[in-house]
């Protein structure tokens, strides 16, 4: 699987999940988020050669087409597959609020 366990441990040029840390205050200007200060959002990147974690039969065909026709622009894209939520703490006035935000952390990628 093209997940963090594999991708973060290997120098992989093809489609894989890459680490990306986002600081809420410094990177986004969201000063109101109390905790966490930031988090690993991660992202997917890298080429999608034939049969690399193909998501659908379409992406399999597209990957094969691109392999046999390297000059063609059509090829599968490396996109998130599994995402996990992130829990944040912020304050409304002095009242603490906890929110679980869905699909915030990319854990694995796929070619689609």
């Amino acid at each position: 699987a093209l997940d963090t366990n594999y991708c973060f441990r290997n120098l992989e040029e093809n489609c894989c999940v890459r680490p990306l840390y986002i600081d809420f205050r410094q990177d986004l200007g969201w000063k109101w988020v109390h905790e966490p200060k930031g988090y690993y959002a991660n992202f997917c990147s890298g080429p999608c050669p034939y049969l690399r974690s193909a998501d659908t039969t379409h992406s399999t065909v597209l990957g094969l087409y691109n392999t046999l026709n390297p000059e063609a622009s059509a090829s599968p894209c490396c996109v998130p597959q599994d995402l996990e939520p992130l829990t944040i703490l912020y304050y409304v006035g002095r009242t603490p609020k906890v929110e679980q935000l869905s699909n915030m952390v990319v854990k694995s990628c796929k070619c689609s």
């Epitope: 109101w32 006035g93 002095r94 929110e99 935000l101």
Partner: antibody, heavy 121, light 111 residues
Framework: EVQLVQSGAEVKKPGASVKVSCKTS????????MNWVRQAPGAGLDWMGQ????????NYNEMFEGRVTLTADTSTSTAYMELSSLRAGDIAVYYC??????????????WGQGTLVTVSS | DIVMTQTPPSLSVSPRETASISCRAS??????????MHWYLQKPGQSPQLLIY???NLESGVSDRFSGSGSGTDFTLRISRVEANDTGVYYC?????????FGQGTKLELK
């Protein structure tokens, strides 16, 4: 230039719902909280609630008894306020107003032009 | 809810004089070293505009004739050398407690 442009005046019957839009430009919509404030004729200002467009998170003033729903469309940088079960006491000008940016609850540095909602049978 | 009480309800001032508006909160609006109190002016037929942020910070583009002071529960907005353009209703607002609340307004007129 930061602009908040609201939809036009509405006339509704008692018990109906109204949905007011607030189209923004000149800043990054997903970076700031959007507040809604209402002002009854000749009266002061009442905070209704707020939304954080990037995540759809909302905080409401209990005064509005769950009748208000705030939403946002990040693709068009537009915020919406829907008020249901309208009554005569809801006749007011409704404003959208951008939060200053340091806190969730905050001052409001840019305001829409206001939308007059009239409730009449 | 924190109740904000403004005095006076209305004020008539001669041009070039100084106007003072008071705002008293039903409980302290101070936290973390800040006073969470702000001031707005609503000119006739217009939307409110922010004048003072966090009790004493002048908002960008606002005349330095406006100044704010105070902490805890008692706050003051001063307008020096009052001009015709200053007429309207002034509101204080707190955001230290949910829900955010406004004062009832002070109407400033010129003599």
């Amino acid at each position: 230039e930061v602009q908040l442009v609201q939809s036009g005046a509405e006339v509704k019957k008692p018990g109906a719902s109204v949905k007011v839009s607030c189209k923004t430009s000149g800043y990054i919509f997903m970076k700031y909280w959007m507040n809604w404030v209402r002002q009854a004729p000749g009266a002061g200002l009442d905070w209704m609630g707020q939304i954080f467009p990037a995540w759809g998170m909302t905080n409401y003033n209990e005064m509005f008894e769950g009748r208000v729903t705030l939403t946002a469309d990040t693709s068009t940088s537009t915020a919406y306020m829907e008020l249901s079960s309208l009554r005569a006491g809801d006749i007011a000008v409704y404003y959208c107003a951008r939060g200053y940016g340091n806190y969730a609850l905050d001052a409001m540095d840019y305001w829409g032009q206001g939308t007059l909602v009239t409730v009449s049978s | 809810d924190i109740v904000m009480t403004q005095t006076p309800p209305s004020l008539s001032v001669s041009p070039r004089e100084t106007a003072s508006i008071s705002c008293r909160a039903s409980e302290s609006v101070d936290s973390y070293g800040n006073s969470f109190m702000h001031w707005y002016l609503q000119k006739p037929g217009q939307s409110p505009q922010l004048l003072i942020y966090l009790a004493s910070n002048l908002e960008s583009g606002v005349s330095d004739r406006f100044s704010g002071s105070g902490s805890g529960t008692d706050f003051t907005l001063r307008i020096s050398r009052v001009e015709a353009n200053d007429t309207g209703v002034y509101y204080c607002q707190q955001n230290n407690e949910d829900p955010l609340t406004f004062g009832q307004g002070t109407k400033l007129e010129l003599k």
